[in-house]
Every structure is written in structure tokens, then in C-alpha cells.
Amino acid sequence: SIPWNLERIIPAWHQTEEDRSPDGSSQVEVYLLDTSIQGAHREIEGRVTITDFNSVPEEDGTRFHRQASKCDSHGTHLAGVVSGRDAGVAKGTSLHSLRVLNCQGKGTVSGTLIGLEFIRKSQLIQPSGPLVVLLPLAGGYSRILNAACRHLARTGVVLVAAAGNFRDDACLYSPASAPEVITVGATNAQDQPVTLGTLGTNFGRCVDLFAPGKDIIGASSDCSTCFMSQSGTSQAAAHVAGIVARMLSREPTLTLAELRQRLIHFSTKDVINMAWFPEDQQVLTPNLVATLPPSTHETGGQLLCRTVWSAHSGPTRTATATARCAPEEELLSCSSFSRSGRRRGDWIEAIGGQQVCKALNAFGGEGVYAVARCCLVPRANCSIHNTPAARAGLETHVHCHQKDHVLTGCSFHWEVEDLSVRRQPALRSRRQPGQCVGHQAASVYASCCHAPGLECKIKEHGISGPSEQVTVACEAGWTLTGCNVLPGASLTLGAYSVDNLCVARVHDTARADRTSGEATVAAAICCRSRPSAKASWVQ
Amino acid sequence: QDEDGDYEELMLALPSQEDGLADEAAHVATATFRRCSKEAWRLPGTYIVVLMEETQRLQIEQTAHRLQTRAARRGYVIKVLHIFYDLFPGFLVKMSSDLLGLALKLPHVEYIEEDSFVFAQ
């Protein structure tokens, strides 16, 4: 029978299928930076090249040297999960092992950097097919380790990292916190976050998605035919590295941005019980469990988007938060969220030639998040149109005035500090299709894009009675690109996108003093790409 | 994901006291020193010196050599363990933490990070 983890990540229609590149050979190479490995195990024999790379600190004590098989345990198991004959995700994939962890599973940032540099050198000396680097390790936040991952990713290498097993915010660890890395948390057979003793999987905005990481059966280094089960975010990352290897075997030209977007888009949604995570992390943590996506040929030119949260701005009066998309992605909208509701809105600005999403804290606020909607829009030409705040009592309108440009998102930013004197912005699709509409003291920003066949529409949902949140979803075939909250009067916490759902949040205390006439409205901008069609606004 | 997390950054912007030697013109450090927030994971005595992105190959070697020379003048021996050329410009050194102020004032230095442990997950 198929082990639960493989059943979970490989849909039935993929089970028997062998992934091969168009020319018939599987050219993907996976580099594993881990302990030494037992290359003679039946699961991985003939698939693994054990490089002579070795950069590890000395072990504490000597007991490990006696039983060398224990030194190989972690790496052998992961190699088996990636490409094992029986229990592997990407059964045909060739794997190169670099030893950066000692017999006790400890390594150093410097050793890992030298390992990453070794891969880069190998790539320069002998260019090959697609490369996937598996980093089943974690240390404290390291600017240089993250920078090295960024540099390697920009050469076309796909890096997959363990989120960490500290039951903590993955952003506090490296390489998990590197944006250019696909960071993987761990779930169990019930699709719940993995608990490991008193700790467990890391979580938060730096995690891209989760994958099986509890009681995973794989190669044991103790004998050539032994299997053992291991748990952790390393195992989860190995599953995703295997999925990525299979995706690249079929379609070697997929970029990191495309791989990440497809992994997110085709993952299993909303099965994780978010109550396991700390309350302040629940909104930031993706409710996604990895599955092997179909090929792009089977799914057509879908518009793919993901939500990127910024770090928390901090509570100072002028604190700003910044969310960035990957270089290949288009920032189609920007919104903001504050748990206290004290925020001065959000806007898009260009920094160093890249559009970024900014959010501003308000006086007395505990801080804000900027929430970027990052999408893959082939041949897109996007621009931002903004209008300064209107005089008191007047509305501010911004629309996309360039021919064939469609509105993909709206942002609003208030100049005034005093939240009580202003009414919040509104986005009116019925009266003014394709326009962002703001109220007193709000600067309004419209994100306008032109791309072949891109069409968009606004979808609103309002609730008059007391409600902590209002949601509106884009229907099948449409992708959420923009999400805003349009309140009647009271304080809103902001809005953000969860997959294809626009969530508008209202302050708890605001519920009681809201009259039935003051509906809180969640407004979504839904877009789709129809390559044959002209860019258009759908009424 | 790119903001610095729970991370120690120390500005060691000490005014130069470089004995007035010709190649050690007054230079105030703008580079920063960083280390892991978890003390037990730190590896004091080993440092990754990260240079500005556009630093040329020869300049990396010169900077490492300059640090060795300046350290030697002060009676310290430092060991350059590795030079990074391909992913980023920099070098790995084993040296006394006493020399961090000196290292941060070297030209081309963007920041210095103390080495730290990583763990199998």
C-alpha cells in the first residue's frame, strides 16, 4: 500500500505516471546539504553522488564515531524521501549530497555558505539541467545566509528549506526566513501541524506551505534494506523538493516564481486547524498542504496570485511596513491590516525600480502589516495612478485612464492622524466601474495593468449587522487580485486575501455601536486571463 | 521575509585610532556587526566578513590581507579560513573579537556576522 505521505501529496492520477522531461531524460539534480549519507542503501543506490564536500564542526564527545551509521541517519532518510525507489517522491531523480551537518546534526552558517558556494561553482564549471537545493537545517536569523540563498536563487537554482522545528515564527530562523527560498512547515497524517515533543513545526508569514512531516517512512542508514520513520520540517521540505524535482522534470523551464505560485495554487487548502498556532500568527500562516500540481499544459494560462505579508511595522507613530513581490511577479494590489485598527492606510511605491506595498501605522496603533497581492501576469504592463486627498466632504476618484488598462487593486492612505474625523474609503463598482473611490483626507491609489486577455471585475459583499469579518470570494475561473474593506462608518482593522477569498476585518468594539444601516463591505477585484481576448473591464 | 528578525546588530562605529599609519587613514566604520540572538548558538571567534556587492575579486583578497596585516601590527594572529568569490564577496576569519572594531573600518566592508550553529530539522 502507498504510504500516507505519498498518497497525500501525489494525487491519484499522478501515482503511476513517470515524470520525464520532453527529451525523455530526467535531468533535474537535487543537492542535499545535510549529514553524510549511506549511498549504498537500496532505496537510493545508483541515484546518489556523494560529493567530497565536507564542512562540519567537531562533535561534542566521541560516541558517534563508533557507530558511523548514526552519522548518516538524517541525510539518508531525506535522500530516500526525495528519490527513494519505493518511498520517494521523485523516484528517478539524481541527488548530490554535501556534508554540512556532523554526526550530531550540527553545522555552522559558514559551513552552509561554503556548501552553497560549492554548488554555485559546480554550476559554473559544468552547467546542467535544473537544480534544486534542499536545506533541511535551520539556525538563528542570518543576514548572510539569507543573502547567499538570494544570490543562488537568482542564478536559477530552486532552494527548498525546512521551516524549523522550534514551534516558533519561521522568520526568526535562517534559511527559512529567506524570501527566495521555498519554506516548508510540517503536517501529520491528519493534516494538522506537527508536534515534536514540547515543540513542533514553525509557522508564520515566512512559511510558504506545509507538507507531510510526521512519521515519514524512508531509508534507514542502519542496513541496506532497512526503513525507519522520522519526523520534522526536514522531511516536509524533502517532500516539496521531490515535488519540485518532478515539476521540473516535466517542464524544465519553470522559474522559481512559477514553481512557488503553482505549489501554492494547487495545494490542499483550509485543512489545517489554525488554532494550533499562536493567535497573532494565525492570519499570517498559510493554510496550505502541498500536492503535486498538474503540468501547465493541462491547466492552461491561469492567472496565479499569492498573498505576501510584510513584517510587523512596530508601534512607533510613523512606523511603516513593506511587502515585496518576487522580481518576476507583478504587485497587483496592496492592502493593510492592524489588530488595533489604528492604521493610516496603504499605498504602492517604486523602490529601486520595483513596486512595493507600504502600510503606515497611526498614532496610538500597535503596528500594521502591509499585504501585497503578487501575481504572475505574462507580458504585463502595470502602473500606479494616484490622486491626493480631496477637500473635506468630497470623494476622491481614481480610474485607469490608459487604453486597455484594467483596475487590479486600490489602496488608500490618510494624511490625517485623527481617525475620528475621517470616513474610510469606499470602492463603488456599480456607480463607477473600474474606479477607486476615497473619502475625506484619503489619497487614493489605483493599480492598473495591461496584459493580453486580462479582464477584471469588482465583487462586493456587505453585512449590516455586527460581524467581526466580512468575506467575498471570486468565483471559479477568476483570481482575486485586490481586496479592500468599505465600512459604513466604524473602525476597520483592514483587509487581506486568503487564497481566492477577500477578508475584511472589523474592530471587535465597533460591532456594538454599528447601526444596521452602516454595512461593512468587503470588495474584491477578481481577474482572469483569457489569452485570446482583449484586456477589458467586466461590469 | 527579508526583514531582520530577532537578531543582534551592533554598530561599532568607533573613531579610527589607526596609529596614524599611511595606509590607515582616518575612517569611521559604517559597517555593522551582527550575531545570532540565541547566545548558545553563537560561535565567537569565527566571523564572516561580508563586503559590498560590487567588490572585485582582487579587492576581496586585499581586504583580507589588510586585516591580517593590521591585526599583526597589534600583536594578533588571524587566520583566513575561506574566501568567498562566487556567491557574495567576503571571507571567513578566525580571530579575536578584539579586532572587530578594526575589521569594521576596513574599506569595502558592508557588515560582519559572527558564525553560528545550524541544526538538522
Epitope: A40, R66, Q67, A68, S69, D222, S224, M228 | -
Partner: antibody, heavy 111, light 106 residues
């Protein structure tokens, strides 16, 4: 397929030595260690010693003085030698590596 | 040296029953424990490796669990072919076998 084949049964005189050869196939002795275990009549399994993949050895303290394990990697053979056998050393001797075991060698110590 | 105390030393059960055998180590063995089935005239057969991993070809009625010093092995829905002697072995530090449990059918 992994196999460990042991040399045939032997009758050993008291105070004499015992030699058993374990020939492995399906894996390399440079990759995995080989353990030796015995079962005396009516008793349980007893670990005797091991030769690790690198060639180093560890022995059960009770047998240390009279046991020697060596190997020839190129021939995929492990050699087990025990000296000064007594009647209570009568047992089935196995070479093993966790999942894969030899068929056993029956050793009888008798005058 | 690590000692392994296995209990019971013998066990009689009916077909279809669930039986459990325990092994206690003299110190923490970090889950490095195997469980073997041994039948007369044959070499021991590895059932479970590293505390709980069922080896390929072994029926799912066999299971293992534990951590630290305490480990257990169970057979649910006992079948006639399960008559054998069962051993635990720690391999955290070299190998040490438990005394064995002889399983008989009532």
C-alpha cells in the same frame, strides 16, 4: 538481493578455536557493519561483536579476550574467530546486519 | 553497558487476541530499538526498526512504540503463524538483546 551466507556446521574440541566465514552479497562491507550473534540451546540471543564498515571492531566485554572479527572487503567476506571454546559455547552462530541475517552456523563443542 | 529487560518471558494467548511485550532499557536509548521474530531453525526476522517502523512485507498487525527507556511491541489479531520467540534489541550503543518472549497459542 541482500544475502549473508555462512560456512557450514562444525564440531570443535574443547579449548580449541572456532572459525566461521560470512560471505555477503547485495551490499558492500565498506558500506555496512556486520554483527555476530549466537543462540545457545534453550537460551536467548546474545550479541558477540561487530566489525564496522571502516574496519574497527567492538566486542561484548564477556568475549573480548578470545574473540577476533576481521574482514576482506574485496572478497566480501567477514571472518569470525573465537578461541578457547568450552561446552557452553555450543550454539547457533549468526552474522547479521539488522534486517538481513545469515542462515546460522551450528557449532557443537564436544570431546 | 546497556541492559534490556524484556517481559513477559513467556506468553499464552488465543487466536485473534492482542498481545503486548515490553522492554525496559537501563538508560535512554533514543528510540534505537528493533524487534525480531525468531522461529526454530531459521534466522531472526526483523519486524520493526527504530521503535515503530514496520519493515517492508511485515503485516500491519505488528506495531511498536516507546521512547526514553520504555518500549513496547504489540501483535493485534493474533494468527497461528505468529507463534515464535520475540526479541527486542537496543542499538543505541552496540547491541544488547532482551531476554526474549516465547509466544504460544492457548
Amino acid at each position: 538481493q541482500v544475502q549473508l551466507k555462512q560456512s557450514g556446521p562444525s564440531l570443535v574440541q574443547p579449548s580449541q578455536s572456532l572459525s566461521i566465514t560470512c560471505t555477503v552479497s547485495g551490499f558492500s562491507l565498506t558500506s555496512y557493519g556486520v554483527h555476530w550473534v549466537r543462540q545457545s540451546p534453550g537460551k536467548g540471543l546474545e550479541w558477540l561483536g561487530v566489525i564496522w564498515r571502516g574496519g574497527s571492531t567492538d566486542y561484548n566485554a564477556a568475549f573480548m579476550s578470545r574473540l577476533s572479527i576481521t574482514k576482506d572487503n574485496s572478497k566480501s567476506q567477514v571472518f569470525f574467530k573465537m578461541n578457547s571454546l568450552q561446552a557452553d559455547d555450543t550454539a547457533i552462530y549468526y552474522c547479521a546486519n539488522h534486517r538481513d541475517w545469515g542462515q546460522g552456523t551450528l557449532v557443537t563443542v564436544s570431546a | 553497558d546497556i541492559q534490556m529487560t524484556q517481559s513477559p518471558s513467556s506468553l499464552s494467548a488465543s487466536l485473534g487476541d492482542k498481545v503486548t511485550i515490553t522492554c525496559k532499557a537501563s538508560q535512554d536509548i533514543n528510540k534505537y530499538i528493533d524487534w525480531y521474530q525468531h522461529k526454530p531453525g531459521k534466522g531472526p526476522r526483523l519486524l520493526i526498526h527504530y521503535t515503530s517502523t514496520l519493515q517492508p512485507g511485515i503485516p500491519s498487525r505488528f506495531s511498536g512504540s516507546g521512547s526514553g527507556r520504555d518500549y513496547s511491541f504489540s501483535i493485534s489479531n493474533l494468527e497461528p503463524e505468529d507463534i515464535a520467540t520475540y526479541y527486542c534489541v537496543q542499538y543505541d550503543d552496540l547491541w544488547t538483546f532482551g531476554g526474549g518472549t516465547k509466544l504460544e497459542i492457548k
